[in-house]
Amino acid sequence: AKLGAVYTEGGFVEGVNKKLGLLGDSVDIFKGIPFAAPTKALENPQPHPGWQGTLKAKNFKKRCLQATITQDSTYGDEDCLYLNIWVPQGRKQVSRDLPVMIWIYGGAFLMGSGHGANFLNNYLYDGEEIATRGNVIVVTFNYRVGPLGFLSTGDANLPGNYGLRDQHMAIAWVKRNIAAFGGDPNNITLFGESAGGASVSLQTLSPYNKGLIRRAISQSGVALSPWVIQKNPLFWAKKVAEKVGCPVGDAARMAQCLKVTDPRALTLAYKVPLAGLEYPMLHYVGFVPVIDGDFIPADPINLYANAADIDYIAGTNNMDGHIFASIDMPAINKGNKKVTEEDFYKLVSEFTITKGLRGAKTTFDVYTESWAQDPSQENKKKTVVDFETDVLFLVPTEIALAQHRANAKSAKTYAYLFSHPSRMPVYPKWVGADHADDIQYVFGKPFATPTGYRPQDRTVSKAMIAYWTNFAKTGDPNMGDSAVPTHWEPYTTENSGYLEITKKMGSSSMKRSLRTNFLRYWTLTYLALPTVTDQEATPVPPTGDSEATPVPPTGDSETAPVPPTGDSGAPPVPPTGDSGAPPVPPTGDSGAPPVPPTGDSGAPPVPPTGDSGAPPVPPTGDSGAPPVPPTGDSGAPPVPPTGDAGPPPVPPTGDSGAPPVPPTGDSGAPPVTPTGDSETAPVPPTGDSGAPPVPPTGDSEAAPVPPTDDSKEAQMPAVIRF
């Protein structure tokens, strides 16, 4: 069966029907359907005016305008808001009421596209394998990235979050139109990786998506990840404005000027120093989502009531931090180079800058506890990787899972750890699953391009597609049309259960309490440490292109940083070393092919010898269940807040000191809606409150934006990376 021309709100579209084997199965593929009008710089997306006749949807459209890897030119287009659809078809009748999976790509909110990098004539985010193996509809789409997607003045002049609104437009388009393609508009699952995983998380939290999303999967990125929310957007807006010759004294004039500036100039005005970096895709990203008081009405930690009815899977790769650690400490991947205590202490101190000497020392002690028994270089290098994995990915994900569970009504919660080791042959044997290593398996690359893979890779891919698509169908990864290797139990705050995904899976793959001691350290011990003043916490600026990479101070010189026990806002971008550019989660679409190359030969990579898939071993000691991360108005994942902490915290009700623990009962308390202009964020509901979602505050056309301290001329943002 095949669809032929499909009528959408924009008009008729016609794709391509691709036959699969001899049994008569096929897949209808639509590439390049517009879901919004061509964009206007730094404006919200608008509905597409439509077309007459039948649109031939047979080729991917250009990605949204972004800098090339070399950053000396741009590629992509302003006219980029298009989506792609894969619809599996059986022999006889056209498919109906299929679950729908919408992919959101990563790329540090700076790069990427809905189709991904091309490798062996196969695009990374080609939805065919997921669609046909899981019998689901797959949708991918483009959204604006970099300054064009996320530049913000922190007020109504340029509220920001244009890229998030693009994502929402795509989701809403799918909801309205997917029935015509054979999809069930009431069964939409979002999934994404890295910045895409964080985007998935943010979309579930935004009141704009009420009723649109049934389920969600965040891979290596959640809304609480420390690199997701920009607390100092005005600083970055001014940097770009200066570069393109716009006035910076008055935000309204600056905004008007930026809107009429050549979008290519805006894109290239934001450069990242790449000198000496082995992986140029790792850079500091200033243009990421903001709390705008409307699309993201409050700190994400306070919005989990909005996701109470959305089934959720979240997880990380066991060495998500490896790529970042290897930038910060190149010795990690070099057998002949050593990681020293001094190196690691310096790295730790940069992450913990707002907690001063005590923060650095305590964190260092916790992480180096195993070094006395095992002083080997392998152990030390693993520690560095574990540290960055914890801070950038694992702990924020654990908090997000706990928040989801604590607020969930009927919704289910599942956690995973992906541990199938990296295929990158140049890595040491001990390296596990690096950042973005999971994508190729979710998208079925071992089947689509089999020459680059081994049977064990196909085993992993088959299992992931089965779990992911079963979840999309039923909300339970074990239940659906696809057989799974072992039962995946839901995550609860009591068991902290997670599934470890490896090449050999059985009942022992279901584990509990991942890195409990470290989770407890970050959420309780570290959080309770006193915050130091700015003078004590001034970082040493990096050398390099200071024009391209501003070195902001670490906080407001007028006020001491607010400790992260209240609504201190989103966590800062943590420092990751002294490279001058903090690592931002790369994506599969980072210019690197999904299967790591072994040179330019195009030959498949040499599989790593040995089974390096073991997850990091948690320290011995108290192996009890991890503490439930705070569900109160803490606003602080386990990374230090910057001095620019925003308004003073709203103390949690009850105990004014320790962060609140999610209650087990039904509190019935509705969330307090932020008013956009209030100095304090709302106190979130504490449990299964049955409360309505936090709505946007004010008119969506001119969203109120919560005041940020960086609106004071004297203050510049606190980014501890530098």
Epitope: P49, A172, Y208
Partner: antibody, heavy 119, light 105 residues
Framework: QVQLVQSGAEVKKPGASVKVSCKAS????????MHWVRQAPGQGLEWIGV????????SYAQKFQGRVTMTRDTSTSTVYMELSSLRSEDTAVYYC????????????WGQGTLVTVSS | DIQMTQSPSSLSASVGDRVTITCRAS?????LNWYQQKPGKAPKLLIY???SLASGVPSRFSGSGSGTDFTLTISSLQPEDFATYYC????????FGQGTKLEIK
């Protein structure tokens, strides 16, 4: 100017079929989608479906799927809407309506054709 | 399908009055249009894309709204404005509101 002229009123028995025509003039026939909308006596408007006169692609509302067929004759710039297995509740005025521009609203309407289904 | 709910379903007003009719969609929509229909006649397009005035429509008609909530306003009623008004959303399965009958008081 744009004109849409529909065929005359019809009286049909339950179970029969009816075919209503809509002749277009004043514009390039193949360039704009044509929709069919009906209105039962004293009731509101109900979308039946759409045809692209350029390639003949059609889309029908779920409610009418399997009972309605839309066709076109480019040589006479006419679109047709055939509804089968008629029942009394199909008694209505049937309108053809052309898109205004793009995927825009229904900007131009025929005068309507009353179809009465009665035994 | 997306449901469109108009309110009020009927309305009595006098010449010169300012009148507002609202239309609410069951989910966020991209395209909303307003039509006027007089007895025995075909509907006539008034407003498209929520706020754009169709060709030849007097400027006393205006539309606003986005997402799920939309309004049609007639700033000063004229005798020829007494009719039934319909909102219409354009998705892959278009639907109309049930209509608002505007009568002379």
């Amino acid at each position: 100017q744009v004109q849409l002229v529909q065929s005359g009123a019809e009286v049909k028995k339950p179970g029969a079929s009816v075919k209503v025509s809509c002749k277009a003039s004043g514009y390039t026939f193949t360039s704009y989608n044509m929709h069919w909308v009906r209105q039962a006596p004293g009731q509101g408007l109900e979308w039946i479906g759409v045809i692209n006169p350029g390639d003949g692609a059609t889309s029908y509302a779920q409610k009418f799927q399997g009972r309605v067929t839309m066709t076109r004759d480019t040589s006479t710039s006419t679109v047709y809407m055939e509804l089968s297995s008629l029942r009394s509740e199909d008694t209505a005025v049937y309108y053809c309506a052309r898109d205004y521009y793009g995927s825009s609203p229904l900007g131009y309407w025929g005068q309507g054709t009353l179809v009465t289904v009665s035994s | 399908d997306i449901q469109m709910t108009q309110s009020p379903s009927s309305l009595s007003a006098s010449v010169g009055d300012r009148v507002t009719i609202t239309c609410r969609a069951s989910q966020s929509i991209s395209y909303l249009n307003w039509y006027q229909q007089k007895p025995g006649k075909a509907p006539k397009l008034l407003i498209y894309a929520a706020s754009s005035l169709a060709s030849g429509v007097p400027s006393r008609f205006s539309g606003s709204g986005s997402g799920t909530d939309f309004t049609l306003t007639i700033s000063s009623l004229q005798p020829e404005d007494f009719a039934t008004y319909y909102c219409h959303q354009r998705s892959s399965s278009p639907t109309f509101g049930q209509g608002t009958k505007l009568e002379i008081k």
